[in-house]
Each structure stands twice: as C-alpha cells, then as structure tokens.
C-alpha cells in the first residue's frame, strides 16, 4: 500500500474528524470486521463536532488488519505522546490507513499547529491544494495553490507543507498565505 | 451444532482454476471472520486468505495474492475460495474455518499435469 | 518460509508433563496476545487448543495449558495421556502477514 503524504490542509480538509490524542492501549483484532482497534485518549478536536453529535468522545480508532491493505500500524510506545490524527468516520466509528495524517503533535510546525487549530478549515470549502509532481505543471483554477514541495523535497517536509495554508484572497482566488501571519 | 464442510477440489492442471466452497452451519454466519488455510502432503499449515463477516474486507498471503478471491454469499451461508493460475505448489488440503476455532476436515486441491 | 519457530519433535511418558515452545519476534507474538495453539491427528482437522494465549476453549481438557514470555510462547500438556499423541501448530497474528503459523511439533508419547 503506497500514497503521497498530504498537504496537511487537505488531509484537514478531506477528514471527517481530526483530533489530538494518545494511544493508550495494546491494539485489538475484531473476529468479525477483521479491523484493528487502537485505544485512544482524545484530548483535543479540531473537525467533526458537527459529525459526531452528542458522541463527542472517541475511545477508539480503527484500521485495516494487515499492512498491505493500508493498515495503519502505530509504532511509537510512549502512551503520553499526543498525536494529530485525521480520519474518516464509518458508522460512527474513527477509520485510518496507511495514507491517514498521524503525525506526533510536537513534530508539527507551530504553522501547521495554527492551521489545524484554526486556519486551514478557512481554505476548505473554496480552495484546493493542487500537487504538482512533474514539470511542467499549471493551474487548472483560480481556487487552486500549487503544490510544489514534491519536486524538491519530502512532501511533508517541504515549506508549503510546514508553513503554509492555500487560502482564499478575494472570490474565485486562493493563493499561497504563511501561518505566520494568521496569528490573531 | 457448528459445523463446516468443504466441496470443490479435485486433480487440475497448472495454470488450471478451480473454485472451493465451505457450507456452514450451527451458527450466524455472518457474524464470522472466515478464513481458509491451506496444508501440503507432509507440511505444515499455511494461511491463505480471511475475509470479514460482511465481507468488506478481504486479506491474502503473498502466495497467492492476485490468483485466489475469496467471496461469501451470507444469504446461503457459504464460503468460497475461486483459484486461478494454479502451480504444483499450490497441491495441498484446503481447510475453511470459522475465524481459527472451528475446522472443516478440508478438501483436497492436487495440481498435476 | 516458517514464520514461528517450533521444535520439531517432542516426548515424554504418560502422566508427565511436557512444553512446546513457539518462538516469533516482536511483530507477532511479543507483539499481541493472539497465540493459538492446533492439535493435529494425521488425517484430521486442526483442533484450537488455546486461543488469545492461554484461553481454553470449552471441552478442551484443563490438562492443556498456555503461557507467553517476550516473543515466546509456550504450550504445556500435563498429566500426558496417549492420546495427546499428535502434531502441534502454534499460531499468531502478525501485521504484515496477517496470520502465521509454526513449523510443528509432533508429540511422542512414549510406552
């Protein structure tokens, strides 16, 4: 199972719910779904408050079974690490795979912590983030900020990953904006 | 009682198909994970492939990954495991179970020319 | 290509007591407590013995035992009868291979 990490603004904006938390527990095999569960201690979210309703805490996430079918296995022991985790909601339940955002909350950048605090569901509903992986690529839209760290770099360890956000400038444009200058 | 029984093997020729079929019985059906596992004349057991109760979700070993499906018809409470491009290798008894608890007592796949 | 590592073969007497041992890595047996242990008569259906390391399904004698240390899990049969007589298959789950087996062990009761 093989994907490009994701802008964070677009794993922001394609999730159902994206939460801060620690995994707690030894994982589990459900005999009859053949998913994995990870136990889970939210302690923040940021997305899905509509989503969820009054189900507002999420105990659990699950994930296929096996790695190649896009598994998420959770490596790190340290049940005190918080995470951001950017997921789908499937019956009510918190569903990952291997191409899900999980990243260790203090490996973000304090500009992609300001986007998923706040920024980047500004950019969701009128602005795409659009990968450029060959040249030559061009804007297919107005609404569209090319993506670029690809060509140089590891897609989530490039500058637009860590510190920018593809919001919008005035209607039918979206451009490039730091994170920097979001504070308020 | 639960009770699983397998039907479909038989001698094929390599690069051959064959479809197995495991009729259950005794319990919900598709409550269950099911899995067929696979033993060679004189070896060990080697898992093949699992599918999940609703079957949404379907994992293969690697030996067999992009030759055998798995499938379940719940309606008729019935496993099925289609094999194609079969090789000599793949001669072996072929169990279904119940997610590893309960065993059918396997049918036999011999891939010949 | 075995993926848990089992002696080949074991024996003891009737009314002793006897371990097989199953040893994996961290991926599968040290990872999780999904260890089965099988029993084997030639000709027949695998029989779980113990399921989630040390679970005993019902009908199956409380002379059957499981135990798990690290990446080794353990079967111990205990007050061996005759019939104990059979081939033993250790299995875990495991991430990336969803689901491994043992190699084996036959069990000779001796006399």
């Known amino acids: 199972c093989t994907c490009v990490p994701p802008h964070p603004q677009t794993a922001f904006c394609n999730s159902d719910l994206v939460i801060r938390a620690k995994f707690v527990g030894t994982p589990e095999v459900n005999q009859t779904t053949l998913y994995q569960r990870y136990e889970i201690k939210m302690t923040k979210m940021y997305k899905g408050f509509q989503a969820l309703g009054d189900a507002a805490d999420i105990r659990f996430v699950y994930t296929p079974a096996m790695e190649s079918v896009c598994g998420y296995f959770h490596r790190s022991h340290n049940r005190s690490e918080e995470f951001l985790i950017a997921g789908k909601l499937q019956d009510g339940l918190l569903h990952i795979t291997t191409c899900s955002f999980v990243a260790p909350w203090n490996s973000l950048s304090l500009a992609q912590r300001r986007g998923f605090t706040k920024t980047y569901t500004v950019g969701c509903e009128e602005c795409t983030v659009f990968p450029c992986l060959s040249i030559p690529c061009k804007l297919q839209s107005g609404t569209h900020c090319l993506w670029t760290d690809q060509l140089l770099q590891g897609s989530e360890k490039g500058f637009q990953s860590r510190h920018l956000a593809c919001l919008p400038r005035e209607p039918g444009l979206c451009t490039w904006q730091s994170l920097r200058s979001q504070i308020a | 009682q639960v009770q699983l029984v397998e039907s479909g093997g038989g001698l094929v020729q390599p690069g051959g198909s064959l479809r197995l079929s495991c009729a259950a019985s005794?319990?919900?059906?598709?409550?269950?994970?099911m899995s067929w596992v696979r033993q060679a004349p004189g070896k060990g057991l080697e898992w093949v492939s699992a599918?999940?109760?609703?079957?949404?979700?379907?994992y293969y070993a690697d030996s067999v990954k992009g030759r055998f499906t798995i499938s379940r018809d719940n309606s008729k409470n019935t496993l099925y495991l289609q094999m194609n491009s079969l090789r000599a290798e793949d001669t072996a008894v072929y169990y279904c179970a119940r997610f590893l608890d309960i065993w059918g007592q396997g049918t036999l796949v011999t891939v010949s020319s | 290509d075995i993926a848990l590592t089992q002696p080949a073969s074991v024996s003891g007497s009737p009314g002793q007591s006897i371990t097989i041992s199953c040893t994996g890595t961290s991926s599968d047996v040290g990872g999780y407590n999904y260890v089965s242990w099988y029993q084997q008569h030639p000709g027949k259906a695998p029989k779980l013995m113990i399921y989630d390391v040390s679970n005993r399904p019902s009908g199956v004698s409380n002379r059957f035992s499981g135990s798990k240390s690290g990446n080794t899990a353990s079967l111990t049969i205990s007050g061996l009868q005759a019939e104990d007589e059979a081939d033993y298959y250790c299995q875990s789950y495991d991430f990336v291979r969803f689901m491994v087996f043992g190699g084996g062990t036959k069990l000779t009761v001796l006399g």
């Open positions: 005794g319990f919900t059906f598709s409550s269950y994970a």
């Open positions: 599918i999940s109760g609703s079957g949404g979700s379907t």
